[in-house]
């Protein structure tokens, strides 16, 4: 039952977080405008990663495409990268959870295959998550960069009597989406991670042990026995012996490691 | 289309608290700002303050102490209270609506408010 | 607060000819998001309320006659009137539209010569 509550949690956490993640690539707040200086102007400017946006008091709100490609900054670029492969990654390993997920019935899929899978799905969330969290953390340092020389730059040359206010950028309400979550992804695919380590049928070698059951008899086998943890749907190790009727989670609470064949 | 009316007394005494009303029509007050603007006679333009579609508002420095903007949107009328008057705030006062670039692309005709005993 | 000067205070111009108004801001109108200058004009005549000629320093207002032309950015504006009418006879004023308080120039008085 651990297992599968682990498993699931772990889908659910990581497609919040992925969702998280396209809607913060998507969002134009990744930088705003620092009103510190200037905190009575009648117009917004922010900007995103595709479009750069201004908001006039008035409630008006116009927004530019960025149609350069070879115009924009490395930097830019790099997260745009990294977001996306961070979605893409994540969209592959939701596919392949659902799959995995042990409550959802394919075919005779065997438990090591729903493991392996498992595994995968959450190595691409961890993955997708690092990607995500690296993306928005070169945005932010690009941002604290920027503002310190900006801020640098204000105070030089104002010796005229005109006054040129620098428009200063600050951290956009995107960036802390993405930082939560990209670590929602993250915990996602360590909680996938912790659950295939629970599916996955573990090889051991066990002597032979003589049971009886009265009433039945019982046919059993020396050598490999393959430990099950009670999850999944074992077909190789299924219920010859029933000793009365139990759900597959009533199976896993047993204390034995000994499966009957 | 759009239209703006202020209404309000035209004699006001010396201390006492200037109120008017700014009724409009042919647009949302939920969506777009409306500014004070006043001319004393003779004079040029002086902008008092505004009230945003959202309700928030912005006052002229040297007025801040003494005005206050509000609005009833189900009604479609915004309000100006400017308290402690002098004989300096006798002046046309007009209402007028915000547009693209903060402008106001539409006044109102404006209404002569006179301080005096 | 942003203080605009406008001269000449007045202006008399013969009819047909151009007539050209100065706007200068302390401070720069330039918004960098968009590269628009927040920089309005407009026209008031006799007995009637201020009426919007240009806003962005230099778009027009729907209606306005294309006579009327705004240009200049950051702090120095201009306001052409390439061929000057009798109705166009009135005060103009510039106003920052950048920064609160939304401050007016004095007025220019353009009178026919």
């Known amino acids: 039952m651990a297992v599968t509550a682990c498993q699931g949690l772990g889908f659910v956490v990581s497609l919040i977080g992925i969702a998280g993640i396209i809607a913060a690539t998507c969002m134009d707040q990744w930088s705003t405008q620092d009103l510190y200086n200037n905190p009575v102007t009648a117009v917004f400017n922010y900007q995103g990663l595709w479009r750069s946006c201004v908001r006039e008091s008035s409630g008006f709100t116009e927004c530019r495409g960025y149609f350069t490609l070879l115009g924009l900054p490395a930097m830019l670029q790099a997260v745009r990268a990294l977001m996306i492969v961070g979605i893409v990654l994540g969209a592959i390993g939701l596919l392949v959870s659902i799959f995995a997920l042990k409550c959802i019935r394919i075919g005779s899929m065997e438990d090591s295959a729903k493991a392996n899978m498992t595994l995968t799905s959450g190595i691409m969330f961890i993955v997708s998550g690092l990607c995500a969290i690296a993306g928005v953390s070169v945005f932010a340092n690009m941002l604290v960069t920027n503002f310190w020389m900006s801020t640098a730059n204000m105070y030089t040359g104002m010796g005229g009597m005109v006054q040129t206010v620098q428009t200063r950028y600050t951290f956009g309400a995107a960036l802390f989406v993405g930082w939560v979550a990209g670590g929602l992804t993250l915990i996602g695919g360590v909680m996938m991670c912790i659950a295939c380590r629970g599916l996955a049928p573990e090889e051991t070698n066990y002597k032979a042990v003589s049971y009886h059951a009265s009433g039945h008899s019982v046919a059993y086998k020396p050598g490999g026995f393959k430990a099950s943890t009670g999850f999944g749907s074992n077909t190789k190790n299924k219920k010859i012996y029933d000793g009365g009727a139990r759900t597959e989670d009533e199976v896993q609470s047993y204390p034995s490691k000994h499966d009957y064949v | 289309q759009v239209q703006l009316q202020e209404s309000g007394p035209g004699l006001v005494k010396p201390s006492e608290t200037l109120s008017l009303t700014c009724t409009v029509s042919?647009?949302?007050?939920?969506?777009?700002?409306v500014s004070w603007i006043r001319q004393p006679p003779g004079k040029g333009l002086e902008w008092i303050g505004v009230?945003?579609?959202?309700?928030?508002?912005n006052y002229h420095s040297t007025l801040i102490s003494r005005v206050t903007i509000s609005k009833d949107t189900s009604k479609n009328q915004v309000f100006l209270k400017l308290s402690s008057v002098t004989a300096a705030d006798t002046a046309v006062y007009y209402c007028?609506?915000?547009?693209?670039?903060?402008?106001?692309?539409?006044w109102g005709q404006g209404t002569l408010v006179t301080v005096s005993s | 607060d942003i203080v605009m000067t406008q001269s000449p205070d007045s202006l008399a111009v013969s009819l047909g000819e151009r007539a050209t108004i100065n706007c200068k801001s302390s401070?720069?109108?330039?918004?960098?998001?968009?590269?628009?200058?927040?920089l309005t004009w407009y026209q008031q005549k006799p007995g009637q309320p201020p009426k919007l000629l240009i806003y962005w320093a230099s778009t027009r207002e729907s209606g306005v006659p294309d006579r009327f032309s705004g240009s200049g950015s950051g702090t120095d504006f201009t306001l052409t009137i390439s061929s000057l009418q009798a109705e166009d006879v009135a005060v103009y004023y510039c106003q920052n539209d950048y920064s609160f308080p939304l401050t007016f120039g004095g007025g220019t008085k353009l009178e026919i010569k």
């Open positions: 042919g647009f949302s007050l939920t969506s777009y700002g």
């Open positions: 007028a609506k915000a547009g693209r670039g903060n402008a106001l692309d539409y």
């Open positions: 401070q720069s109108l330039l918004n960098s998001g968009n590269q628009k200058n927040y």
């Open positions: 009230i945003w579609g959202d309700g928030s508002t």
